[in-house]
C-alpha cells in the first residue's frame, strides 16, 4: 500500500566541489532510473560555526527512508554532515534541520492499542 505518492522527475542540483568533479556548480538535474524504481531528491550540508555550507544537492536513488517525505528535513541530532531526502519535483530546493530526540516510553503501564 502506498499513500499519496509523488513522482520525482527533477531535482535542484548543486556541487560545492564542481571544479574537481568536473560538473556544473548549480542547475536542475533530471532524475533517471529503472522504470520500476522510485526517485528522490537530496541535500547535504555542513554547519560551520552557524554558517550553512551546502555540499551537494541532486537526485537520489530509490530509498525506502525517503518514502512519504514531501519536505527535505534532517532530523538526526547534531550530525557531522547534514542529510535529507524527499519525494517530489525540486523538493530539495529548501531544506531544514529539525532534530527529534528519541522518545522514551512512559513509566506508567499504558493500554496496548488494538491492531
Amino acid at each position: 500500500a502506498i499513500l499519496g505518492r509523488s513522482e520525482t522527475q527533477e531535482c535542484l542540483f548543486f556541487n560545492a566541489n564542481w571544479e574537481k568533479d568536473r560538473t556544473n556548480q548549480t542547475g536542475v538535474e533530471p532524475c533517471y532510473g529503472d522504470k520500476d524504481k522510485r526517485r528522490h531528491c537530496f541535500a547535504t550540508w555542513k554547519n560551520i560555526s552557524g554558517s550553512i555550507e551546502i555540499v551537494k544537492q541532486g537526485c537520489w536513488l530509490d530509498d525506502i527512508n525517503c518514502y512519504d517525505r514531501t519536505d527535505c528535513v534532517e532530523k538526526k541530532d547534531s550530525p557531522e554532515v547534514y542529510f535529507c531526502c524527499c519525494e517530489g519535483n525540486m523538493c530539495n530546493e529548501k531544506f531544514s534541520y529539525f532534530p527529534q530526540m528519541e522518545v522514551t516510553q512512559p513509566t506508567s503501564n499504558p493500554v496496548t492499542p488494538k491492531p
Epitope: A1, I2, L3, G4, R5, G33, D34, D36, K37, R38, L61, D62, D63, I64, N65, C66, Y67, D68, R69, K75, K76, D77, F83, C85, Q100, M101, E102, V103
Partner: antibody
Framework: EVQLLESGGGLVQPGGSLRLSCAAS????????MAWVRQAPGKGLEWVSG????????FYTDSVKGRFTVSRDNSRNTLYLQMNSLRAEDTAVYYC???????????WGQGTLVTVSS | QTVVTQEPSFSVSPGGTVTLTCGFN?????????PSWYQQTPGQAPRTLIY???TRSSGVPDRFSGSILGNKAALTITGAQADDESDYYC??????????FGGGTKLTVLG
C-alpha cells in the same frame, strides 16, 4: 545503544493469528523505515515486510500478501506484524530490523519464534 | 520472480582469501541495488558486514570488503580466521519497497 526487542511469538494452530511486536530504543524510531525478516528452521533468511517512516507505505513478500499486516506506532517506538491465516510454512524465527539510508538493515533484534502446528 | 543466487558452500584455509558472490536471474547486479552482506552464526541474529556495495559497517574488520565483480556483488575475506566460519547472506534492494535475500553461503574455515 540501539536495541530492538521482539515479542509475541509462540505456538499457534494453522489458520490462527498472532501479533508480533518490536520495541525499539536507542535511536529516534520515527526517523527510520523498518522491516521484518524471518528464518525457517535450518533455512536461510527471507524478507517478509517493510514500512516507511510514517507508515504510509507498506510492502510484503508475495507469500504473505493479504495475510500479514505491518504497522508502526511512532509515539510508542514500536513496530508490529499482525499475522492472520497462519500456515505451517510460516514457522520461523521473526526478526525486526532497522533500515538505514541506502535501504540496508543496520540493526537487528534477537528474534521471536513462531511455530504453526496442530 | 527475482532469485538471488549465492554459492551454497565454500571452504577456505586459515589465513587464506575467499570471495563469495551474489548474482540474480534478471541481469547484472549494480551499485543501484545497494548490495549488502550479513554474517550469521547458528542461533544468533544476523550481523551487518557491508552495505552500499563496499562500505564496512561499524566495528567490522578491514579483512572484509565488498565490490562488484563482473555482473555480481562480491564479499571478499582476506586472512580468514576460524571465527569467520558462519553463514553469509547478500541482500539486493530491488526498489519500490522490495528486498531479496540470497540463499546464503556456508563458509567453512578448514583445520
Amino acid at each position: 545503544e540501539v536495541q530492538l526487542l521482539e515479542s509475541g511469538g509462540g505456538l499457534v494452530q494453522p489458520g490462527g493469528s498472532l501479533r508480533l511486536s518490536c520495541a525499539a530504543s536507542g535511536f529516534t524510531f520515527r526517523n527510520y523505515a523498518m522491516a521484518w525478516v524471518r528464518q525457517a528452521p535450518g533455512k536461510g533468511l527471507e524478507w517478509v515486510s517493510g514500512i516507511s517512516v510514517t507508515g504510509g507505505s507498506t510492502f510484503y513478500t508475495d507469500s504473505v500478501k493479504g495475510r500479514f499486516t505491518v504497522s508502526r506506532d511512532n509515539s510508542r517506538n514500536t513496530l508490529y506484524l499482525q499475522m492472520n491465516s497462519l500456515r505451517a510454512e510460516d514457522t520461523a524465527v521473526y526478526y525486526c530490523a532497522k533500515v538505514y539510508y541506502t535501504s540496508f538493515f543496520d540493526y537487528w533484534g534477537q528474534g521471536t519464534l513462531v511455530t504453526v502446528s496442530s | 520472480q527475482t532469485v538471488v543466487t549465492q554459492e551454497p558452500s565454500f571452504s577456505v584455509s586459515p589465513g587464506g582469501t575467499v570471495t563469495l558472490t551474489c548474482g540474480f536471474n534478471s541481469g547484472s547486479v549494480s551499485t543501484s541495488y545497494y548490495p549488502s552482506w550479513y554474517q550469521q552464526t547458528p542461533g544468533q541474529a544476523p550481523r551487518t558486514l557491508i552495505y552500499n556495495t563496499n562500505t564496512r559497517s561499524s566495528g567490522v574488520p578491514d579483512r572484509f570488503s565488498g565490490s562488484i565483480l563482473g555482473n555480481k556483488a562480491a564479499l571478499t575475506i582476506t586472512g580468514a580466521q576460524a571465527d569467520d566460519e558462519s553463514d553469509y547472506y547478500c541482500v539486493l534492494w530491488m526498489g519500490s519497497g522490495i528486498w531479496v535475500f540470497g540463499g546464503g553461503t556456508k563458509l567453512t574455515v578448514l583445520g
